[in-house]
C-alpha cells in the first residue's frame, strides 16, 4: 500500500460529549460547540476538529456557537455563550459563509 499522507501535527483536546470514546481525543484542532435546540437548554460539547475549519469562523447565533483553538487541551476551560434572542426580522442564519 502507498504510505498514507500525513494530516499534519495532531493536538490533544478535552472530549466531553455523548460520542466521546474517552476523556481526550486527538485532532487537527480542538473544538467547543454550544448548541441550543428548540425547547431545550443549551448543551456544550468539547472535542476535536479535522474537517471544515470554516465552521470555526461562523459568528455566534441564538442557536449555535463554534469555538476552535490549536494548543494542547486548549478547549478544557472555555465557556461559550449564545447571542441574545433577536426579533424575527433580524435573526441570523446558521450559515457559516
Amino acid at each position: 500500500d502507498p504510505v498514507k499522507p500525513s494530516r499534519g501535527p495532531l493536538v490533544t483536546c478535552t472530549c466531553e460529549s455523548p460520542h466521546c470514546r474517552g476523556p481526550t481525543c486527538q485532532g487537527a484542532w480542538c473544538t467547543v460547540v454550544l448548541v441550543r435546540e428548540e425547547g431545550r437548554h443549551p448543551q456544550e460539547h468539547r472535542g476535536c476538529g479535522n474537517l471544515h475549519r470554516e465552521l470555526c469562523r461562523g459568528r455566534p447565533t441564538e442557536f449555535v456557537n463554534h469555538y476552535c483553538c490549536d494548543s494542547h487541551l486548549c478547549n478544557r476551560n472555555v465557556s461559550l455563550v449564545l447571542e441574545a434572542t433577536q426579533t424575527p426580522s433580524e435573526q441570523p442564519g446558521t450559515d457559516s459563509q
Epitope: P5, R7, H19
Partner: antibody, heavy 118, light 108 residues
Framework: QVQLQESGPGLVKPSQTLSLTCTVS??????????WNWIRQHPGKGLEWIGY???????YYNPSLKSRVTISVDTSKNQFSLKLSSVTAADTAVYYC??????????WGQGTMVTDSS | EIVLTQSPGTLSLSPGERATLSCRAS???????LAWYQQKPGQAPRLLIY???SRATGIPDRFSGSGSGTDFTLTISRLEPEDFAVYYC?????????FGGGTKVEIK
C-alpha cells in the same frame, strides 16, 4: 451499519420549493465526526455539491446555489433536509444525501429523482 | 474556488488492461482531502479512495491512488468487467468542496 435514505416528492411545479429529507439509520446524526451533505446530478452529467450541515445546525452551501438553498437538521428524528426554492427545469436531477467524515463521502443514499413538472 | 479537471474524458480499454485516470486541481490541495468515486448507471457513487491513496473498506487492491499538490492519479491495475464505469475525483473537508467532471472507462 449506517444507511441513508432520501424521501420527498418526485415532481415539483416550476417556481415552487423542492423539499427532500434524508433519514439516517444505524448511527447518530449527532456524532461530531460527520457532516451531512446534499449532492445532485443532472441527467447524463456530473456530480454537483449543494451543501452540508453539521449536527449543531451550522451549514455551508455551494455559492452558486446559496440564495435558494436551506439545509436543516432534526437530531431527534435523525434526519436532515434540503429545501431548494424557485425551482426551474434546470433543477431536474437525481438528489443524493451523503455522510462525510475523514474517509470522505463514505456513505450515500440511493438517490431520488426530482423532476420539474412543467 | 478549486476546479478539478479530469482527463481523459473517456478511456476505451479492454478487460485486463491498465487504466490511468488523471485529476488536476486549479490550485494546490491537501492530499489528505482528495477522494475518488466510482459510479455505475442508475447507482449512487461508491467511495474508492480517500486521503489520495487510502483504499476504502472493501475496495479491491487493483485500485490505487497517488499524487499530491495539484496532480492526482487513480490507477486500476487490471480492468475487470465490473470496473467499466464513470470515475470522479473530489476535494472534500473544506468549504472548497468540489467534484471533477468525471472520466468514463468504457469497453474497447
Amino acid at each position: 451499519q449506517v444507511q441513508l435514505q432520501e424521501s420527498g416528492p418526485g415532481l415539483v411545479k416550476p417556481s415552487q420549493t423542492l423539499s427532500l429529507t434524508c433519514t439516517v439509520s444505524g448511527g447518530s446524526i449527532s456524532s461530531g465526526d460527520y457532516y451531512w451533505n446534499w449532492i445532485r446530478q443532472h441527467p447524463g452529467k456530473g456530480l454537483e455539491w449543494i451543501g452540508y450541515i453539521y449536527y449543531s445546525g451550522s451549514t455551508y452551501y455551494n455559492p452558486s446555489l446559496k440564495s435558494r438553498v436551506t439545509i436543516s437538521v432534526d437530531t431527534s428524528k435523525n434526519q436532515f433536509s434540503l429545501k431548494l426554492s424557485s425551482v426551474t427545469a434546470a433543477d431536474t436531477a437525481v438528489y443524493y444525501c451523503a455522510r462525510e467524515g475523514l474517509e470522505a463521502f463514505d456513505i450515500w443514499g440511493q438517490g431520488t429523482m426530482v423532476t420539474d413538472s412543467s | 474556488e478549486i476546479v478539478l479537471t479530469q482527463s481523459p474524458g473517456t478511456l476505451s480499454l479492454s478487460p485486463g488492461e491498465r487504466a490511468t485516470l488523471s485529476c488536476r486541481a486549479s490550485q494546490s490541495v491537501s492530499s489528505s482531502y482528495l477522494a475518488w468515486y466510482q459510479q455505475k448507471p442508475g447507482q449512487a457513487p461508491r467511495l474508492l479512495i480517500y486521503d489520495a491513496s487510502s483504499r476504502a473498506t472493501g475496495i479491491p487492491d487493483r485500485f490505487s491512488g497517488s499524487g499530491s499538490g495539484t496532480d492526482f492519479t487513480l490507477t486500476i491495475s487490471r480492468l475487470e468487467p465490473e470496473d467499466f464505469a464513470v470515475y470522479y475525483c473530489q476535494h472534500y473537508g473544506s468549504s472548497l468542496l468540489t467534484f471533477g467532471g468525471g472520466t468514463k472507462v468504457e469497453i474497447k
